[in-house]
């Protein structure tokens, strides 16, 4: 059975040129964490694998920082980078929990983080 | 040319065991995961486990825990499937396959398979 | 555990026919894999993550579907098509395919 929740850091703004860190969490499982993918709508940004390591997609390789921890960095953002993000944790033996991140990319310099809020 | 090798079929009494080989050729052993599929006569596909010969670590099917135990030789880039306590449940095909690790391709290779018939 | 179903367990089609072959899951998943098995062989790998085709694949099988509903469809059947087509699923442990679409040439 599934008992996990996922926190992550909610809808975010951030300015033109700047950087994001996108985090998720996992609680509430005594779960193993066997691999987090990062996805930007179905597109493939990164991969975190316990037993393997890192991995970036080789066209955000320029722009996608690993780290930290289970967590991803946005580099040298663009208006194009708004949207939808998910955290895709597969777990053993639960299974596959996701999260999702609002990232709205501002021209101004008035970029405000909001609010935490949980997933289960 | 990417390679599963399996080793050949095994006629083995009930109540013994049996340890099957799975002998990796074209890619780095420690770059993928193995995973073990059982195929019973004119039945589908059943998964055993996954297995990192890097580390060791093993996800396996609660059903087989204390049924198979894998091990790999990186050495040889071999991995090997232990069958214990044979019954006649336990006549099958089974195959070893490498997964894609970033989850893009599911098992992407596999051995040839290597037939157990349990018998007195 | 995620229990996928497969419908029809047996189907036979002639060539130039449309086939669709569905896997329904028991719980929603992420994605789909699917996989071609003919007798004596070892599976192949036939279509990951839903919708696209493994190496070698023809282009007129095509994969879609999301949550608890999947399927893999050849849009003209052609002789070489004849196999058991398998789902799979990655979204939980443990690992499960479904039991199988035996498809056979009319």
């Known amino acids: 059975m599934m008992t996990g929740t996922i926190e992550t850091t909610g809808n975010i703004s951030a300015e033109k040129g700047g950087s994001i860190i996108l985090q998720c969490h996992l609680s509430s499982t005594t779960a193993q964490v066997t691999q987090v993918n990062w996805e930007q709508q179905d597109q493939l940004l990164a991969i975190c694998n316990a037993d393997l390591g890192w991995h970036i997609s080789p066209s955000f390789k320029d722009r996608v920082a690993p780290g930290p921890g289970l967590g991803l960095t946005l580099q040298s953002l663009t208006v194009n980078d708004t949207g939808e993000y998910f955290c895709i944790y597969h777990t053993y033996p639960d299974g596959t929990y996701t999260g999702r991140i609002f990232l709205e990319v501002l021209e101004s310099s008035v970029a405000e983080h909001g609010a935490r809020f949980q997933i289960p | 040319d990417i390679q599963l090798k399996q080793s050949g079929a095994e006629l083995v009494r009930p109540g013994a065991s049996v340890k099957l080989s799975c002998k990796a050729s074209?890619?780095?052993?420690?770059?993928?995961?193995i995973n073990w599929v059982k195929q019973r006569p004119g039945q589908g596909l059943e998964w055993i486990a996954r297995?990192?010969?890097?580390?060791?670590?093993?996800y396996y099917n609660e059903k087989f825990k204390g049924k198979a135990t894998l091990t790999a030789e990186k050495s040889s880039s071999t991995a090997y499937m232990q069958l214990s306590s044979l019954t006649s449940e336990d006549s099958a095909v089974y195959f070893c396959?490498?997964?894609?690790?970033?989850?893009?391709?599911?098992?992407?290779?596999w051995g040839q398979g290597t037939t157990v018939t349990v018998s007195s | 555990d995620i229990v996928l179903t497969q419908s029809p367990a047996i189907m036979s089609a002639s060539p130039g026919e449309k086939v669709t072959i569905s896997c329904s899951a028991n719980?929603?998943?992420?994605?789909m894999y699917w996989y071609q098995q003919k007798p004596g062989s070892s599976p192949k790998p036939w279509i990951y993550?839903?919708?696209n085709l493994a190496s070698g694949v023809p282009a007129r099988f095509s994969g879609s579907g999301s949550g608890t509903s999947y399927s893999l469809t050849i849009s003209s059947m052609e002789a070489e098509d004849a196999a058991t087509y398998y789902c799979?699923?990655?979204?939980?442990?443990?690992?499960?395919f479904g039991a199988g679409t035996k498809l056979e040439l009319k």
């Open positions: 396959a490498r997964e894609a690790w970033l989850l893009f391709y599911g098992m992407d290779y």
């Open positions: 074209g890619y780095t052993f420690t770059d993928s995961y």
């Open positions: 297995f990192y010969p890097g580390s060791g670590n093993t």
């Open positions: 719980s929603s998943v992420s994605y």
């Open positions: 993550r839903t919708s």
């Open positions: 799979q699923q990655y979204h939980s442990y443990p690992l499960t």
